[in-house]
Interface confidence: medium
């Protein structure tokens, strides 16, 4: 069965997506399975359907049950089931297991805790974060978009993290909370925001017209195994492969260097038969990984050949 478990707390907003997907143009009908009663689409109702979404604004314990969604297209119908459970708010701080979303892990140099289900809601910053019911304070904690970043993670940072945000529906505000566990892994390797060793930012490289020129983009990403990292060149903001100039090609450096245990990559840009118009281009060395993207820009300038006349 196309069934999905969803849960929430009474007096909070809960939005559930139909487990069956369809194009935005398809209509979706929702029913309360126990009574086969159609869920209204009018937004004045506390519980209403809005396309693929079923909205409880706010939720009540009595809303618990199985809801059926039928995605209707001109050629077929698809049926899904949302098993919704609304719980009473706990008087104490403990969050029971049945209210917990999936556990995430972090390490000393890398930690991100995403707020579960937040993409279903119409929310605006700030996103509030709590650990074991205490509001997080201090410069080590940064709420960024829909996730929390913890700097210099320690084993003591393990615990239950709750995100709290406000869902807005037609000018009315509803609170939403979601909790997940965070565990800390002790790892020797780490990854960090890319560091470009060469070229220097805004470097000017002298080249001779008619000769060949090489530019090397070199960056390091951390220590040990690196996950989804790359260096590459762009010309005027365009990938080399898309730029369409066969004289200008990039090729991977000989190997990944691990000097001092650092994981680094080289990418060489080869320009054959340098032309005047090459001096007008902007050459960007890009280094990227899951932490982000760093860019160093290089421009070429004409190197005058040595005059041998006496």
């Amino acid at each position: 069965k196309f069934s999905k478990q969803s849960w929430g707390l009474e007096n909070e907003a809960l939005i559930v997506r139909c487990p069956r997907q369809g194009k935005p143009s398809y209509t979706v009908d929702w029913y309360y399975s126990q009574t086969n009663k159609s869920i209204p689409t009018q937004e004045r109702n506390r519980v209403f359907a809005s396309g693929q979404l079923l909205k409880f604004l706010p939720a009540a314990v009595a809303d618990s049950g199985i809801y059926t969604c039928i995605v209707r297209s001109p050629t077929f119908n698809r049926t899904g089931y949302a098993n919704v459970t609304i719980y009473k708010k706990q008087s104490d701080c403990n969050v029971p297991d049945y209210l917990m979303y999936s556990t995430v892990s972090g390490s000393e140099k890398n930690s991100k805790i995403y707020c579960p289900t937040i993409d279903l809601y119409n929310w605006t910053a700030p996103l509030e974060w709590f650990k074991n019911c205490q509001a997080l304070q201090g410069s080590r904690y940064r709420a960024h978009k829909s996730f929390l970043v913890i700097d210099n993670v320690m084993t003591e940072d393990a615990g239950d993290y709750t995100c709290k945000f406000i869902h807005n529906e037609n000018g009315a505000n509803y609170s939403v909370t979601a909790t997940r566990s965070f565990t800390v892994k002790d790892e020797q390797g780490f990854s960090l925001f890319p560091v470009i060793g060469a070229p220097a930012q805004n470097e000017i490289k002298e080249v001779e017209i008619g000769k060949n020129a090489n530019l090397t983009c070199s960056a390091c990403f951390g220590k040990g195994t690196q996950f989804l990292a790359a260096v590459l060149w762009q010309l005027n903001g365009t990938k080399i492969t898309d730029f369409g100039e066969p004289r200008i090609q990039q090729e991977e450096g000989q190997n990944q260097s691990f000097s001092n245990g650092l994981a680094c990559l080289d990418m060489v840009l080869r320009i054959a038969d340098v032309k005047e118009e090459d001096l007008l281009l902007q050459y960007d060395c890009l280094a990227l990984n899951l932490h982000g993207l760093r860019r160093h820009t290089v421009r070429l300038s004409r190197k005058n050949p040595i005059d041998h006349h006496s």
Epitope: F221, G224, T225, Q226, F227, L228, A229, A230, L232, K239, I240, T241, Q250, E252, Q256, F258, A263, L265, L288, N289, L290, L293
Partner: nanobody, 116 residues
Framework: ESGGGSVQAGGSLRLSCAAS???????MGWFRQAPGKEREGVAM??????DYADSVKGRFSISRDSAKNTLYLQMNSLKPEDTGMYYC?????????????????WGQGTQVTVSS
């Protein structure tokens, strides 16, 4: 890879792929091969993007955990035609996304069987 198995149509599975050794993976992805068919791309991830084959869009979700150096493939609403051996692969970010030849490191594969 891990997480494969047998499941009824409409069920879910989550595949995991852990990258190890002193490597830098530029792009990682999931490919599958059904009996008697060519290996085909299912979902790809780089540092800044995700791509899905049309046949799995809206049902499969690729995610990555840089702390664990692990790539995941969450497969929901599985269909019998999703049956096959699923492989995790690492390749170059500037390569052709869906071409197996541009992926230079491969896992041993995990079998996914979806019955109706």
């Amino acid at each position: 890879e891990s997480g494969g198995g047998s499941v009824q149509a409409g069920g879910s599975l989550r595949l995991s792929c852990a990258a190890s050794g002193y490597t830098i993976n530029y792009r990682m992805g999931w490919f599958r091969q059904a009996p008697g068919k060519e290996r085909e791309g299912v979902a790809m991830a780089s540092a800044i993007s995700e791509d899905y084959a049309d046949s799995v869009k809206g049902r499969f979700s690729i995610s990555r955990d840089s702390a664990k150096n692990t790539l995941y493939l969450q497969m929901n609403s599985l269909k019998p035609e999703d049956t096959g051996m699923y492989y995790c692969a690492a390749g170059r970010v500037w390569g052709r996304l869906w071409n197996p030849d541009d992926y230079n490191s491969w896992g041993q594969g995990t079998q996914v069987t979806v019955s109706s």
